[in-house]
């Protein structure tokens, strides 16, 4: 592959439907603008979950209505996905693009399998 991107193989979402994982990339040079995209692969379909572009040294900002939040530190991005339900179980791929300065570098992680288990409803108490 092109740029190396590492992410954990498996993550278990919390009972509140929150999953966090680190996406780490090996930058060939000194990028100042980085774009991180989370993709979900289910069967052969790939859909974009969320994306953020950030300047190195600045905070990672997703859109207000995004289910993702994140922080960056050097070549590491700490990603959190919230609002997950059992049906969202799947492979979540981290895509990293070094946008500026040229040249453009692209890296795709192998994916993190996120398991989501819906909490059991609390039994009625008499």
């Amino acid at each position: 592959k092109a740029m190396h991107v590492a992410q954990p193989a498996v993550v278990l979402a919390s009972s509140r439907g929150i999953a966090s994982f680190v996406c780490e990339y090996a930058s060939p040079g000194k990028a100042t603008e980085v774009r991180v995209t989370v993709l979900r692969q289910a069967d052969s379909q790939v859909t974009e979950v969320c994306a953020a572009t950030y300047m190195m040294g600045n905070e990672l900002t997703f859109l207000d209505d995004s289910i993702c939040t994140g922080t960056s530190s050097g070549n590491q991005v700490n990603l959190t996905i919230q609002g997950l339900r059992a049906m969202d179980t799947g492979l979540y791929i981290c895509k990293v693009e070094l946008m500026y300065p040229p040249p453009y570098y692209l890296g795709i992680g192998n994916g993190t399998q996120i398991y989501v288990i819906d909490p059991e409803p609390c039994p009625d108490s008499d």
Partner: antibody, heavy 115, light 107 residues
Framework: EVQLVESGGGLVQPGGSLRLSCAAS????????MNWVRQAPGKGLEWLAQ??????????YYSASVKGRFTISRDDSKNSVYLQMNSLKTEDTGVYYC??????WGQGTLVTVSS | DIQMTQSPSSLSASVGDRVTITCRTS??????LNWYQRKPGKSPKLLIY???NLASGVSSRFSGSGSGTDYTLTISSLQPEDVATYYC?????????FGSGTKLEIK
């Protein structure tokens, strides 16, 4: 201003060897992966080889058409990348370009393999 | 290896026309696609990187779109200086294959 200047092209007989050079300036050479691309007469662009940089342990990659015959190398102290071409064939004739990860391109150098 | 299928191989259009060139890949390349312009006797020039991003100094007439396996280069209003051969390229992984090219001419 970014500049990539290729040299070393020329006429060579089939089976012969040639070493191409590419001198870079105007950007941080050591931060970049370098590639060689060629265009044969009347044909399209063909990627040949890539050499990555120190963070990537100077890994090299080749197209199937040149693997085992061509060798890419670089000298970061001289801001230069090279292509050693051995066992040349008539179909290796073309214009050879060096490129910094496809963003910046040289003007090309013509290689002619003919008896 | 990733195969690149570019179409059409040649195209003739009038000044002011909207022109589209397509590139289909044999597998998902996650937007890892560049577009180049090559004029006779000149070096290739990067137009679009990462499928949708306009390279520095390139006219906004050019735009790129697509994802997965299907990508498009669009020239919104063809100009005489756009006569050239256009190539797509996979930049996701080695070998960094190019498409076969589209030769664009003015009617």
């Amino acid at each position: 201003e970014v500049q990539l200047v290729e040299s070393g092209g020329g006429l060579v007989q089939p089976g012969g060897s040639l070493r191409l050079s590419c001198a870079a300036s105007g950007f941080t050479f050591s931060d970049n992966w370098m590639n060689w691309v060629r265009q044969a007469p009347g044909k399209g662009l063909e990627w040949l080889a890539q050499i990555r940089n120190k963070p990537y342990n100077y890994e090299t990659y080749y197209s199937a058409s040149v693997k085992g015959r061509f060798t890419i190398s670089r000298d970061d102290s001289k801001n230069s990348v090279y292509l050693q071409m051995n066992s040349l064939k008539t179909e290796d004739t073309g214009v050879y370009y060096c490129t910094a990860q496809f963003a910046y391109w040289g003007q090309g150098t013509l290689v002619t393999v003919s008896s | 290896d990733i195969q690149m299928t570019q179409s059409p191989s040649s195209l003739s259009a009038s000044v002011g026309d909207r022109v589209t060139i397509t590139c289909r890949t044999s597998e998902n390349i996650y937007g890892g696609l560049n577009w180049y312009q090559r004029k006779p006797g000149k070096s290739p020039k990067l137009l679009i990187y990462g499928a949708t991003n306009l390279a520095s100094g390139v006219s906004s007439r050019f735009s790129g779109s697509g994802s997965g396996t299907d990508y498009t280069l669009t020239i919104s209003s063809l100009q005489p200086e756009d006569v050239a051969t256009y190539y797509c390229q996979n930049v996701l992984r080695s070998p960094f294959t190019f498409g076969s090219g589209t030769k664009l001419e003015i009617k």
